[in-house]
Interface confidence: low
């Protein structure tokens, strides 16, 4: 249980105040984290509060400014990147967001040796992606969907690809669906470790159906946004991987990497690329029916100047109970022998664990085991493997960092973080310098976040990088809600929940309950993290109890729970929220006439289905940007969990699991439906169809659209959204304004 002290003793009661909605919208209680920008084993860069770029040397304790705020300001730079040879810095300005990860920007190159911007052969604008080589100061960049290479920043560019075309052919950058659902990056090019080769993906979207929506702007006529967007069952992008020798790029040109035969026999995806050495690369492929993944290790053949991927170096990962991997198929972390690797996948008991693969997956040596899951491998050195898991104290919503000594036999395991600040910190991530000489730990809670620097050999804390003192002081006179994380055992299913309770919570009283739900496959809402957000305000000021429940389909508790929703989205996720609500009512402090549910995106889908479940449990609810039918959502995501919307596959459940099919059931609840009209991800179409079905069923409901807003509803729309939802809930719960 995490009880946030509300510090309400009689003597202090007068000076304490509840959170306000304004606090939340202004970000008054936001926290800072510190991730060093590592540039060597013992050095990192950091942008100071006054915008100087400062280099820190941990071992000498010295720091100096490598780039002044004056230089940054001269081009209005918002980001920077130091070349590995430390001779140049790129400065990024005119940031223009595209999708979740992608953006375009203008780039200037600053020469640190003479203190001037590089003139001549300047970069074109706007650039879609730019990066330094891992060694020296070569530049690769993507402009108008084509890839260019510069040997030095002042040199003329060498054009690598020529077929790039807007919305048709993408080189070195992903198309919409690969960016959002497969790579989760803005780039699709990868330098080899010493910068000899550059690998890149080409995505051909020529045959993909296009989603078109209006962008209203300020003009007389709205613009139409067109995005090649494959919905479930539609034609997918065609992907090819090429590698070019950057030392002699014109010599043989880009060489295509062959696709494994068992993958190429039907529709497939490329899922990731990992360089092992300058002349060995590892590619991961996935069948369109995403239960078979192939990891292929390819070697450069000097004599033929080609890449060879022998069948003996193909490793197959297959799931018989669900899809391959968790949210994504995990990526390998290679060991120093440059052929064996560590990888997270399900063990025989159905828990995701680290395995060591030396020759075949069948002969994999299991490194971690237990009824918990390894979540991320951070770093493998010659004697240690650092990873995160939720093993400690058996709370799935925690993250601790562990070190396994792989240099000794049998390997010994130690938890690096479990005892550092055990009340304050139970959810960590880490960032390692070269060779794991040093690392930063970033603790996200449940207490106020703190970032610390550690010695990679002894794990000793060297210094605090950021402890959020100002936030701590600001919260001293705030009545924060109490939070507890517990579990319900129901029909052999463990439902973990987080309950956020009003500061003066009294078990003998009755409180309105708001369920906040996401519930998407491989997600996790019940986490031991710090947050002062909208629901904190609802508990602190408005006296609501808020609960988050991780039901079937959620992550890090084993495959039985995760894969329970396979091919059946919209069933068990909803059932488990309802089950939890019934259990909360049994606890005796919930006013069963005042229960609401809300969610965003997948959570909007679940909240809509819960409201339309016909249980009579919910008085009202809100769906923000919900999916309403899986036929409307992206192929890569949807088919992973649902299969194809075809008669001989899973069309029946696609049809049965829509929100529209349950329109009649909304008659006895108050429903608020919200969506942005320029949502590139969950298209406005989803809410338009819900609204149409409700109108056709003559069911009253409330709705709000946000013009020209995407899936995030950012900026002023955020303030409007939360104010609007607050009014709706207060009205539903009969709370005075």
């Amino acid at each position: 249980i995490v009880l946030r002290p509300s510090r309400v003793h009689n003597s202090e009661e007068n000076t304490m105040r509840a959170l306000t909605l304004k606090d939340i919208l202004n970000g008054t209680f936001s926290y800072k984290t510190f991730f060093p920008n590592w540039i060597s084993g013992q050095e990192y860069l950091h942008q100071s509060a006054d915008n100087n770029i400062v280099l820190y040397n941990i071992e000498t304790g010295q720091s100096y400014t490598i780039l002044s705020n004056r230089t940054m300001k001269s081009v209005n730079a918002s980001n920077y990147g130091l070349s590995p040879d430390r001779q140049f810095v790129y400065l990024e300005s005119d940031y223009s967001k595209l999708w979740r990860y992608s953006y375009t920007a203008t780039y200037y190159i600053y020469d640190l040796s003479n203190g001037e911007f590089v003139r001549g052969n300047e970069l074109p604008r706007p650039i879609q992606y730019l990066c330094w080589s891992p060694v020296g100061s070569k530049l690769a960049y993507v402009y108008q969907n084509n890839i260019y290479l510069k040997q030095r920043p002042g040199d003329p560019p060498f054009q690598i690809t020529f077929n790039g075309r807007e919305n048709k052919i993408f080189n070195g950058i992903p198309d919409w669906v690969y960016e959002e659902e497969m790579l989760a990056t803005k780039y699709a090019l990868w330098w080899s470790p010493n910068g000899k080769f550059l690998a890149y993906a080409e995505f051909n979207d020529t045959d993909i159906p296009v989603i078109a929506y209006s962008y209203y702007g300020d003009e007389q006529y709205p613009r139409t946004i067109n995005i090649p967007y494959p919905k479930a069952g539609a034609k997918n992008p065609v992907v090819r991987i090429f590698i070019i020798d950057t030392t002699y790029p014109a010599y043989v040109g880009p060489q295509e990497v062959p696709v494994p035969a068992m993958i190429a026999s039907s529709d497939y995806y490329f899922s990731w690329l990992t360089w092992v050495t300058d002349e060995r690369v590892c590619l991961q492929w996935l069948k369109r029916v995403q239960n078979v993944s192939v990891l292929s290790i390819c070697d450069f053949r000097e004599d033929w100047q080609t890449w060879d991927c022998p069948k003996t170096q193909e490793h197959i990962e297959e799931s018989r109970t669900g899809w391959a991997g968790g949210f994504f198929v995990s990526t390998p972390v290679f060991s120093y022998d440059a052929i064996s690797y560590y990888k997270i996948f399900s063990d025989k008991d159905g828990y995701k664990h680290i395995h060591y693969i030396k020759d075949t997956v069948e002969n994999a040596i299991q490194i971690t085991s237990g009824k918990w899951e390894a979540i991320n491998i951070f770093r493998v050195t010659q004697d240690s493997l650092f990873y995160s898991s939720n093993e400690f104290e058996e709370y799935p919503g925690r993250r601790n960092i562990y070190r396994i000594s792989i240099g000794s036999y049998p390997p010994s395991k130690k938890c690096v973080t479990c005892h550092l600040r055990k009340e304050r910190c139970q959810y960590y991530t880490a960032s390692f310098s070269d060779y794991a000489k040093y690392y930063a730990l970033v603790c996200y809670g449940p207490g106020i976040p703190i970032s610390t620097l550690h010695d990679g050999r002894t794990d000793q804390e060297i210094k605090i990088l950021e402890e959020n003192k100002e936030l701590e002081n600001a919260l001293k006179n705030i009545q924060l809600p109490k939070e507890e994380i517990k579990k319900l055992e129901v029909d052999e299913i463990t439902l973990w929940y987080k309950m956020i309770l009003p500061p003066q919570f009294d078990r003998s009283k009755k409180y309105p309950l708001l369920i906040q739900v996401y519930g998407g496959p491989c997600s996790q809402s019940v986490r031991s993290v710090f947050a002062v957000n909208w629901i904190s305000y609802l508990a602190s000021k408005e006296g609501m109890v808020i609960a988050l429940v991780d039901g079937r389909g959620t992550a890090f508790q084993g495959d039985k729970l995760l894969y329970a929703v396979y091919r059946k989205l919209g069933v068990y996720e909803v059932e488990d929220q309802i089950t939890a609500v019934r259990k909360f009512i049994e606890m005796g402090f919930i006013d069963e006439k005042r229960i609401a549910i809300w969610g965003w995106s997948y959570g909007g889908y679940v909240s809509s289905l819960a409201l339309a479940s016909g249980t009579g449990l919910f008085k009202c609810g809100i769906a923000v940007a919900p999916v309403s039918s899986w036929e409307y959502y992206a192929s890569v995501y949807t088919e992973r969990f649902m299969g194809l919307p075809t008669k001989d596959d899973n069309l029946e459940h696609y049809k049965n699991s829509t929100v529209m099919a349950r329109a009649e059931y909304f008659r006895n609840v108050d429903y608020l439906l919200i969506h942005g009209t320029a949502d590139d991800n969950v298209h406005f179409q989803n809410s338009a169809q819900i609204a149409k079905a409700l109108v056709n069923a003559q069911v009253d409901f409330q709705a709000m659209w946000y013009s020209d807003q995407n899936h995030g509803l950012s900026g002023l729309s955020t303030n409007h959204l939360y104010t609007h939802m607050t009014h709706f809930l207060k009205q539903c719960f009969s709370l005075s304004d």
Epitope: G370, W372, S412, H419
Partner: antibody, heavy 117, light 108 residues
């Protein structure tokens, strides 16, 4: 307040059996690893056995195959079933709450087991 | 298994004096070490975990240091209630958890 109270100790003949209990209050035992540690008269501390939150059990080589650790979550009680007892098992047996799987943050007062003919 | 060696076996000091207790591990254990205090007829009590972190309610005259194989427990100024036996325990490599043989701090 966390409290641990051991019981079940006493005099037993070599080869005999005893069952020790450790009743916990102030926390839910099911969420934590628990440990048995013993201390022979005038000697130091020796780890005997442990049980994880998940139910996984561990034993010192000296007691493996003779001792069994278990718990009843509904009673919030930890047990140590000791069979084939030997004179060298004579000790005060402490039950301790384990932080994670690491050190022992709360201890009971102990119960004395004497193995003698 | 990892062997912990504590020294000295007995430390005779007067109230107000500084006590320095040593614990040596047979192989490196990073900072995975705890210290306990045990008074006659009582159960052990956790003092220090992770080599240098004081447990809840432990006065700040107790401090721990060290990492790898050499560890020290320091009591900056002995109070009458500090005369007891002190044990170190490793949790780097387990099972088994191992304890040191103990150091008795007695009144001179």
């Amino acid at each position: 307040d966390v409290q641990l109270v051991e019981s079940g100790g006493g005099l037993v003949q070599p080869g005999g059996s005893l069952r020790l209990s450790c009743a916990a209050s102030g926390f839910s035992m099911s969420n934590f690893a628990m440990t048995w540690v013993r201390q022979a008269p005038g000697e130091g501390l020796e780890w005997v056995s442990g049980i994880r939150g998940s139910g996984t059990t561990y034993y010192a080589e000296s007691v493996k195959g003779r001792f069994t650790v278990s718990r009843d979550n509904s009673k919030n009680t930890l047990y140590l079933q000791m069979n084939s007892l030997r004179a060298e098992d004579t000790a005060i047996y402490y039950c301790a709450k384990t932080w994670g799987t690491e050190y022992f943050d709360y201890w009971g007062l102990g119960t004395l087991v004497t193995v003698s003919s | 298994e990892i062997v912990l060696t504590q020294s000295p076996g007995t430390l005779s000091l007067s109230p107000g004096e500084r006590a320095t207790l040593s614990c040596r591990a047979s192989q490196p254990i990073s900072s995975y070490l705890a210290w306990y205090q045990q008074k006659p007829g009582q159960a052990p009590r956790l003092l220090i975990f992770s080599a240098s972190n004081r447990a809840t309610g432990i006065p700040d005259r107790f401090s721990g240091s060290g990492s790898g194989t050499e560890f020290t427990l320091t009591i900056s100024s002995l109070e009458p209630e500090d005369f007891a036996v002190y044990y170190c325990q490793q949790y780097y490599d387990w099972p088994p958890y191992t304890f040191g043989g103990g150091t008795k701090v007695e009144i001179k």
